[in-house]
């Protein structure tokens, strides 16, 4: 591309030239693709509301848990087991939590009357000892409840454990009570207040509308908009048993999904509630199943600070609010339409694929000869020729050769390395169809030439008898009219080419060669056709006529302009033309690659 461009270069437009194929089959395929794609595009546009600009929800949550539980605790007092009844209200079983979560206690283990002193550890694999050597002063085991003193002391009976400085007596390692102490928490209810906002659409709403009956309880089908949930129902929805989860605790997700259509003509913005168990119910004992934590109630007794340690098991409810609000937006619509336009090109891609496949050499040589029902597909070869123009990379080694006794043209795209061009096999290329309109440009003398005496009037391209081989003819010559090349030895092999592959009459003996290539009258006409006011001296005229004759031969024998550019003239034709239009002095330069 040129470095600088003129103003006219800016104001121009390029477009593709297309081939229109009148075909019932391909027309049907095209419309089938277009209808399917159009239907899908329209369906997706409407069903996914792709004409809307969507914005994520911003939300705040507030919860209130209600319910009373009666707890029957078994305690040991002076070695005697006693059953104690106590009532737990909201303040007893709920704990303040950050974020969109609330916690309900369902079970607990109490260690009462703890104070800071020295005492033996609770017996476990890690704390049992047989001598002081099994304990280490200052050692703090992650699983321990205190700092070891280095002494091994009696815990109970003949059990000895390491002594620790800790809150004593040490909390016992025991299982959570079964059934859960607050099993009746199943009947507790929670009110969820959820305010949401779509600032980009300037829209705010909440899950509790003014006319709501506050005595309702959520039900998936009968009351799906009620914001009051029974804890047992939440677990039933996820397929879990509240009583089982209550023993060890767990984590439950309450999902509030807002899918809001904020368009005036289809306005809808109500929440959908769903539930999901979030903790791992399959965890084994060693990986701490459920959900628990410890908290302590501190008090003073006889001026000694004491505490009651409570290991709390319960259910943490995480409220997960998500969703989007969408409103019609012309830009989104245009972007969507733009992004789907390319799908309409699928028909062209598919049809081009069919044409390319059915016109391949593989189909021509392996499928069509054997498969009769595939025969109609041969038409694709015609479509392919009309659609595609194949060009070969114009390498310096590219050459085309045409033998008069062969129907095809040979393409030689390799270095000759001293071999005669006559002997190089090359690749067979079909001869382009003759465009007879070009002949209309030739002078009338060529069309209406009177018959030559002694020659019959029917078409007679070559004389039947072979020209006897002259003693001067090179070994590669098959027509007897070729002459050795005058080029240096390195370039000589390029001109070592005959007009024939097998022995026979020379093309230069044909009447048409004389009329098309050697006729001064025709060549002058062609030169003037290109340059009407051409006036040349004798030497220049000969040179112009000679090169015009070369071109005429190449166009005649090779047909295609591209092939003619790389055509190598046979030695016999080259020397016959040179004889007719000689160079006054110096050597002939021979073939030069145009690129």
């Amino acid at each position: 591309m040129p470095a600088c461009c003129s103003c006219s270069d800016v104001f121009q437009y390029e477009t593709n030239k297309v081939t229109r194929i009148q075909s019932m089959n391909y027309g049907t395929i095209k419309w089938f693709f277009h209808v399917i794609i159009f239907s899908y595009v329209c369906f997706a546009l409407v069903s996914d509301k792709l004409y809307q600009r969507k914005e994520p929800v911003i939300s705040s949550v507030h919860t209130k848990v209600k319910g009373i539980a009666e707890v029957k605790e078994e305690i040991v007092e002076n070695g005697v087991k006693k059953l104690v009844h106590s009532v737990f209200d909201t303040a007893d079983y709920t704990f303040p939590l950050q974020g969109n979560s609330f916690f309900v206690m369902t079970n607990f283990l109490k260690t009462e009357g703890q104070e800071q002193r020295l005492c033996p550890e609770y017996p476990t694999r890690r704390t049992l000892c047989s001598s002081d050597r099994g304990c280490k002063k200052g050692w703090m085991d992650p699983q321990s409840k205190g700092i070891q003193t280095g002494r091994c002391v009696v815990y109970e009976g003949n059990q000895k454990t390491c002594e620790v400085s800790a809150w004593c007596p040490i909390e016992a390692v025991e299982e959570a009570p079964r059934p859960a102490l607050l099993n009746s928490a199943e009947n507790f209810t929670v009110l969820i207040k959820n305010n949401i906002d779509f600032p980009g659409h300037n829209y705010t709403t909440r899950n509790i509308l003014p006319g709501l009956n506050i005595t309702c309880t959520f039900h998936k089908t009968q009351n799906p908009q009620c914001p009051i949930f029974r804890l047992g129902d939440i677990f039933r929805e996820t397929g879990d048993n509240f009583s089982d989860v209550a023993i060890q605790g767990g984590i439950m997700g309450i999902e509030i999904y807002w899918d809001c259509n904020l368009d005036r003509w289809f306005h809808h913005c109500r929440p959908k509630y769903s539930f999901r168990r979030l903790d791992d119910k399959t965890t084994n004992v060693s990986l701490y199943p459920g959900y628990n934590f410890r908290y302590a109630k501190y008090y003073k007794e006889n001026n000694v600070e004491k505490r009651t340690l409570i290991k709390v098991f319960g259910i943490r409810f995480d409220i997960l609010v998500f969703g989007t609000g969408g409103k019609f937006d012309i830009i989104q619509l245009v972007v969507y339409i733009g992004s789907t336009l390319s799908y309409f090109g699928l028909a062209a891609v598919f049809i081009d694929f069919l044409i390319d496949t059915y016109s391949s050499n593989c189909c021509r040589s392996h499928i069509y000869p054997w498969c009769k029902c595939c025969q109609p597909c041969v038409v694709n070869e015609y479509y392919y020729r009309k659609k595609c123009e194949s060009i070969v990379e114009p390498k310096p080694t590219l050459k085309y050769v045409s033998f008069v006794d062969e129907s095809h043209i040979r393409m030689v795209n390799q270095q000759l390395l001293g071999r005669s061009l006559q002997d190089v096999k090359g690749q067979e290329v079909p001869r382009p169809a003759m465009d007879f309109t070009d002949l209309s440009r030739l002078p009338l003398a060529l069309h209406d030439t009177p018959p030559i005496p002694g020659q019959p009037e029917e078409i007679q391209l070559l004389r039947k008898e072979a020209t006897p081989r002259s003693r001067d003819s090179p070994v590669w010559c098959q027509c007897g009219s070729c002459l050795p090349s005058q080029l240096p030895e390195s370039h000589r092999c390029l001109e070592e080419l005959c007009c024939r592959k097998k022995p026979g009459a020379c093309i230069t003996t044909s009447e048409l060669f004389r009329k098309l290539v050697l006729s001064r009258h025709v060549l002058q006409f062609l030169l003037l056709y290109q340059e009407p006011l051409l006036a040349l001296d004798v030497d220049s005229t000969n040179s112009r006529l000679r090169h015009c004759a070369y071109r005429c031969y190449a166009t005649w024998r090779f047909g295609s302009q591209d092939m003619a550019d790389f055509a190598i003239l046979p030695s016999c034709c080259r020397w016959r033309i040179r004889k007719e239009f000689p160079k006054s002095e110096g050597q002939y330069s021979g073939f030069k690659s145009p690129y």
Partner: nanobody
Framework: EVQLVESGGGVVQPGGSLRLSCAAS????????MGWFRQAPGKEREFVAA???????DYGDSVKGRFTISRDDAKNTVPLQMNSLKPEDTAVYYC???????????????????????WGQGTLVTVKS
Amino acid sequence: EVQLVESGGGVVQPGGSLRLSCAASGRTFRHYAMGWFRQAPGKEREFVAAISSYGSTDYGDSVKGRFTISRDDAKNTVPLQMNSLKPEDTAVYYCAAADETLGAVPNFRLHEKYEYEYWGQGTLVTVKS
């Protein structure tokens, strides 16, 4: 779950050597601390030697310098090489395993029999002239 099988016990003369071997089943063998204990007739079970999952060792006072414990995690075995044997080394020798998956056994606790969850059936070693 780990199964332990001891082998290599027998009768040996004082000053002689013997090599006991403990073969463990289970793919997680490398996560276990392994120990050897012995129990002479009418006596309490006594610690002999132990090796943690990361290779640290501990020996009972009466065997230090004479016995050597090692482990081969590829073969799931724990050999105990016993040299300069004495008549007082006569006992049933037990192999034991302590799970260290959730936390290593502290070195000072390797000798405690309470740390070991899994025990073998034992192999008898008799030292007499």
